[in-house]
Structure formats: C-alpha cells, structure tokens
C-alpha cells in the first residue's frame, strides 16, 4: 500500500494548529471498518493517534491532535496537530493498514519569529570620541536559535568585540542577547540584525550615538525617535532618559510615565520612591538604573490595545518630557490554502482559491501571482477580521478559469515587520483533484 | 549560457508596421514570460507587454492594445512583437527581456540586446 | 495603474560618495525591483524582490523600505556605479518602471 507524505518538512510557528499530510489510495468498495490507521512518533513509537474498528479511538498524544474523519474514505488520512510547542519537533510516522500495510514519516519543523531587538548602550551619558560603550541587542521568545550579525551604519560588518548568548525559556523559546563592545568615533550606527535561519525571519535593532555634552538649562529628556516595534505578548522597553547633575539624588527626582492623549497615569515615581504601576500592572521602571538617569518604562505582555504614544516627565530642579510610541506587531502565520470545487478538475472549470494567513497584527497587505510572476489582480476579495484581541485573521479568495496547469500564490505582507508570508497552490493534468491524491 | 538574441535595426515609414524577433537559447523557452520593453531616445523604460510562449496567453499596457501584437513560435524558441499603424513617436530601441525568478520573487534576468527601430518620412 | 516615482532624476556625485535613491510607489507592492543601465546598453538586474543583489552586484548596494518608499544606497561610490538606475514593479498591472535616476560624476 502506497502511502504518500510531504518530501519537506512541515514548518509550523508555536502557537498555531499544523496538518500533516498523509493519503493513501483506497480501492472500489473500501470502507472505513477495513481501516487501520496508526500515527505515531517515529523515534520514540509513542502512539499519537489511531482510527481502528471503524471508529477514531482518539488523541494519545495531550489531546492536540485529530483526524480529517469526513476525508478518511477519500484516503485523506492527515493529522491535526493544535496549538503546537517546541517539544512537537520531530519526525511521526503515519501507518496505514487496509488489506495491505504502508507507512511514511513526515517531519514537524517548528518556528517561532524573534521580537524586534531592543537595544541598550552603558555608559549612555557624557559620552566622549573615544570612549569604549557596551552595546546589547536582545531579541525575544523565538525558535530555532537565531543568528546574530552587527554592522556599522555603512554597511560593513562589525565581527570584533561580540558575545552572544542565547537562553532557552521553559516553552523552548530563545531569548538571545548580543553585546558588541567598541570604541565611539564622533558618531555612529551600530545595527544588529537576528535571523530566523528557519523562517528566513529578520529583525533589526540599530541605535545611532552621538558624542555630546547636554546643553545647560531645562532638563533634556531623550527618547526614540522611531516608534518601538513590540510583538505581540512580548515585553516592551520604552526607552527615556535623562542626564543627571553631580550631586544627584533620587530624593529630586519626580517622573511620570503617562498616555501622551488622554493624559492617563501610567507609572510614577515620587518623592523617592516607586509609586507603582497604574496600567493594568503590567510596568515597571528600572529602579537600579534610576540615578545614572534611565527613566525607561518595562511594558509586559504587550497587546494591541498598548498601541500608542507614552510621555515621560522627568522634573528634578528643571523639568522636561518627551513623547515615544508604541508600535504593536504580530506576524502572520504561512497562509493554508483552498480550493473549491477540490475534485475532478479539468482546464476551463472556475475554481475558488482562498488564503487564510491568521492573528496577525495591524491588518496585512495581500497579493496574488501566476506561476510566472504575473499579478492576479482581477476577480479577487479580500477581508480581514479582527479578534477579541485585535488580532487579525486575513481571507483572501481568487475566482480563477483553470488553465492546463499553473501555479496560484499568495503573499501576506505585515507592513511594520516587513514579513512576508507565503502561500502556494499548484494544479496540474486534467482531470485531478486537491489535495492530490496518492 | 542563456541568451535572448534580437533581430537587427529597422527604418520604417509612418503608418507601416515592424515586426522584431527575439530568439531564445539557453533554457527551456516555454518556462518564463517574454515581455516587451522600449525606450525612447533619451527617455525612460516603457512596458508593452508580455506573452506566455507556453499557453501562448498575453497582456498588453493599455497605451499599445490594438497596435502591438506578441506571438512565440515554441519550435524555433523565438517570440515576436509586431507594431503597427507606426508613427514618429514609436521611434526608440526595443528590447525583449525574461520575467524569471522563483515564485513569489521575479524579475527581468536576461535582456535582448535591443532592436532600433526608425520611422521617418 | 502603480505610479512609481524616482527622485532625485539626475544626480551629481564623486567618488567615494554616499548617494541615496529613492523610489515612491503610489500604492503599496508586493517587491521592488532595480536595474541599472549604461548608455547604448541594455539593462542588467541589479537588485530583486525588494533587497536582494543580483549576481555580481557589489555589497555597496542596498535598499531600505519605508511603507511605499523604496531607497537604493550606493555607500562609497566607485567608477563603475555611474549610469541610470529604475525601479520596478509588477504587483499590479501594469507592470511599471519609475522615469530613471541618471548618477553622473560630479
């Protein structure tokens, strides 16, 4: 018995649901009662899932996965396998008995894109032409481990000075922390860059020094210019600072963190001490970076709703404030695709393709191709519908006359992540039918 | 190598047509589109068009539907672009070039070495 | 139709220098592409799906995104850099090229 999987691996992000695709060819007359069908984990053989005595026994592996049951008869023998972990990696076998026996290993690569870094710099005041600064970029929760590469601001990579660290967390997940050590010219950028080598999945941090003495007078508070980019359930840094006097005490200093349009209490710290989170609990300041002058504000858990603008006040004797923005993100999942009518398909027929790319954030761009790069931009609706989280999920369907054969692909763009994800569907001969079968 | 060799220069009358070649060597001419480009003396790059020599479909820029017709000839792997009803604005260099690449990414890796074409009174 | 706009047109620049070209597209594409043409040449590719160098194309080049605005940075211009730039897309029909950027030697 002929039993057909993915050559590739199936590349699942944690988090969201994976299919793996196993067919066989049922012959005239076969009923579901004559069928065996047993997933298991091909180095360990721990059962996973089977359907015998014509009945699906069931989920053995904590109760994630299940079976196309209305697709069995058709020799659609896949497996569902829900909101995957990092420990799903690896190799399951589909077995499949009839009269006759065959079985195929397919393989679960699993993926998790990395935040965009945040990055620090100490000493981050007075500093001179010169001096040698501590840089670190760190980048969150992703899967597999990433690769790290500095560059300076034209280009040329910055391979002297660096240490990388990467740490799994309990769900498997990769925090990596890069610190470039390096002596400040009279400016400078100094970008890192952390690769998904799996997802092909770039971030980018960067962060430009100017060497300069703080001018007298009002208390210049600095942020970034750019909005922080923050995913999704990832912890923020709102970066703000200030320079401090000699003679600095803490007991001088009053700070503010609050929503820059509805003026809303967000973190403070008074009268020498931390007064606490006022949003939701889910701030913090960095206390023992206080007195050298780093107001930054700690957001965890990000969520859309976070997205916005925050001002910090800094008032010691002067006072100052500057605004930062919050830039919330969620990449998109790689896009499932269908096709209906899915059977029998023969050049001339019309045929409905939908991509479905899910919980991404804000709203995607969407566009279709041929096989030879040609836009479909003709018969094609798009919708996209947020979550109870703002999370959105994007459908797109193209209404297409089948040609002989063609390649239909859908590209999902995150426009803050400048992520790209891809789906493809390929049709070929005459007649057939998709999924094709074994 | 892959190559896309174009036919030579041509003067033409006002109100005639020209038909340029452009013959492939080098991969498999049914694989990838053949588009038209041309540029005008001192001017920019101007689609005209494209065609699938393998279903033999085609699209054309709105500017030349009617005036330009592109065909491809799978047994001698060589694609044709006719313009007709010419006029002294047509005048420029014709290039034909392949629209390759994997999908979703794809862009003109080979270009003819281009056809003058003239139209003078 | 997908407008892409190249500015500046022309540019005066030496040797050694750090040029930016920008193109601005009217909507929001799928890729950008580049080419680069000499005079009484035809185009070569230069760089493909948005940030990509083609073949042979010296590490000087890259490109930044910012929503629709596509940027070509040559970091230390060298001899051979001077010619026209065009960027293009094919997201929509359409396809289009921007007008051209000409780098001449100041």
């Known amino acids: 018995l002929e039993v057909q999987v993915p050559e590739d691996p199936v590349v699942a992000l944690v988090g969201t649901d994976a299919t793996l695709r196993c067919s066989f060819s049922p012959e005239p007359g076969f009923s579901l009662a004559q069928l065996n069908l047993i997933w298991q984990l091909t180095d360990t053989k721990q059962l996973v899932h089977s359907f015998t005595e014509g009945r699906d026994q069931g989920s053995a592996y904590a109760n994630r996965t299940a079976l196309f049951l209305d697709l069995l008869a058709q020799g659609n023998a896949s497996l569902r396998l829900q909101r995957v972990r990092v420990a799903d990696e690896g190799s399951f076998t589909c077995f499949v008995s009839i009269r006759d026996f065959g079985s195929a290993a397919v393989s679960l690569q699993v993926a998790a894109p990395y935040s965009k870094p945040s990055m620090t710099l100490e000493p981050n005041k007075d500093l001179r032409p010169g001096d040698t600064v501590t840089i670190t970029c760190s980048s969150y929760r992703g899967y597999p481990e990433a690769e790290v590469f500095w560059q300076d601001g034209q280009g040329a990579p910055l391979t002297g000075n660096v240490t990388t660290s990467q740490m799994a967390n309990e769900q498997g997940l990769f925090d990596v922390h890069s610190v470039l050590r390096v002596v400040l010219g009279a400016n400078g950028t100094y970008s890192c860059l952390v690769r998904n080598p799996v997802l092909q999945q770039d971030a980018h941090g960067s962060i430009t020094i100017t060497p300069q003495r703080s001018p007298t007078g009002a208390v210049e508070v600095q942020v970034p210019e750019d909005p922080v980019v923050a995913l999704v359930g990832t912890d923020a840094t709102l970066r703000c600072s200030f320079s401090p006097e000699p003679g600095f005490s803490l007991a001088q200093l009053n700070l503010i963190w609050q929503l820059t349009d509805t003026k809303q209490l967000v973190h403070s710290f008074t009268e020498g001490r931390d007064q606490g989170s006022a949003y939701a609990n889910r701030t913090a300041l960095f206390l023992d970076l206080l007195a050298q002058g780093n107001a930054s504000l700690r957001l965890q858990r990000v969520r859309v709703a976070d997205e916005g603008s925050f001002t910090c006040f800094v008032s010691i004797r002067d006072f100052g404030s500057a605004a930062v923005s919050l830039q919330v993100a969620a990449p998109y999942s790689k896009p499932s695709m269908t096709l209906e009518p899915n059977k029998d398909l023969r050049p001339g027929d019309t045929v409905t393709i939908t991509c479905s790319s899910y919980r991404g954030y804000p709203e995607a761009e969407v566009f279709w191709q041929d096989g030879q790069g040609a836009p479909l931009t003709g018969n094609v609706t798009t919708s996209q519908m947020a979550n109870e989280q703002g999370l959105f999920d994007v459908h797109s369907v193209l209404r297409v006359v089948l040609g002989a054969n063609g390649t239909y692909s859908c590209l999902v763009r995150n426009p803050v992540l400048q992520q790209d994800a891809h789906g493809s569907v390929t049709i070929t001969g005459q007649p057939m039918t998709f999924p094709p079968e074994a | 190598e892959v190559q896309l060799v174009q036919s030579g220069a041509e003067v033409k009358k006002p109100g005639s047509s020209v038909k340029v070649s452009c013959k492939a060597s080098?991969?498999?001419?049914?694989?990838?589109?053949i588009h038209w480009v041309r540029q005008a003396p001192g001017q920019g790059l101007e689609w005209m068009g494209y065609?699938?020599?393998?279903?033999?479909?085609?699209d054309y820029a709105q500017k030349f539907q009617g005036r330009v017709t592109l065909t491809a000839d799978k047994s001698t792997s060589t694609a044709y672009m006719e313009l007709s009803s010419l006029r002294s604005e047509d005048t420029a260099v014709y290039y034909c070039?392949?629209?390759?690449?994997?999908?979703?990414?794809?862009?003109?890796?080979?270009w003819g070495q281009g056809t003058t074409v003239t139209v003078s009174s | 139709d997908i407008q892409l706009t190249q500015s500046p047109s022309f540019l005066s620049a030496s040797v050694g220098d750090r040029v930016t070209i920008t193109c601005r597209a009217s909507?929001?594409?799928?890729?950008m592409n580049w080419y680069q043409q000499k005079p009484g040449k035809s185009p070569k590719p230069w760089i493909y799906?948005?940030?990509n160098l083609a073949s042979g194309v010296p590490s000087r080049f890259s490109v930044s995104v910012s929503g629709t605005e596509h940027t070509l940075t040559i970091s230390s211009l060298q001899p051979e850099d001077f010619a026209t730039y065009y960027c293009?897309?094919?997201?929509?029909?359409?396809?289009?090229f921007g007008q051209g950027t000409k780098l001449e030697i100041k």
């Open positions: 070039a392949r629209y390759s690449g994997s999908t979703p990414y794809w862009y003109f890796d080979v």
């Open positions: 080098g991969y498999s001419f049914t694989s990838y589109t």
């Open positions: 065609i699938n020599p393998n279903s033999r479909n085609t």
């Open positions: 909507s929001s594409v799928s890729y």
């Open positions: 799906a948005t940030s």
């Open positions: 293009q897309q094919w997201s929509s029909n359409p396809l289009t």
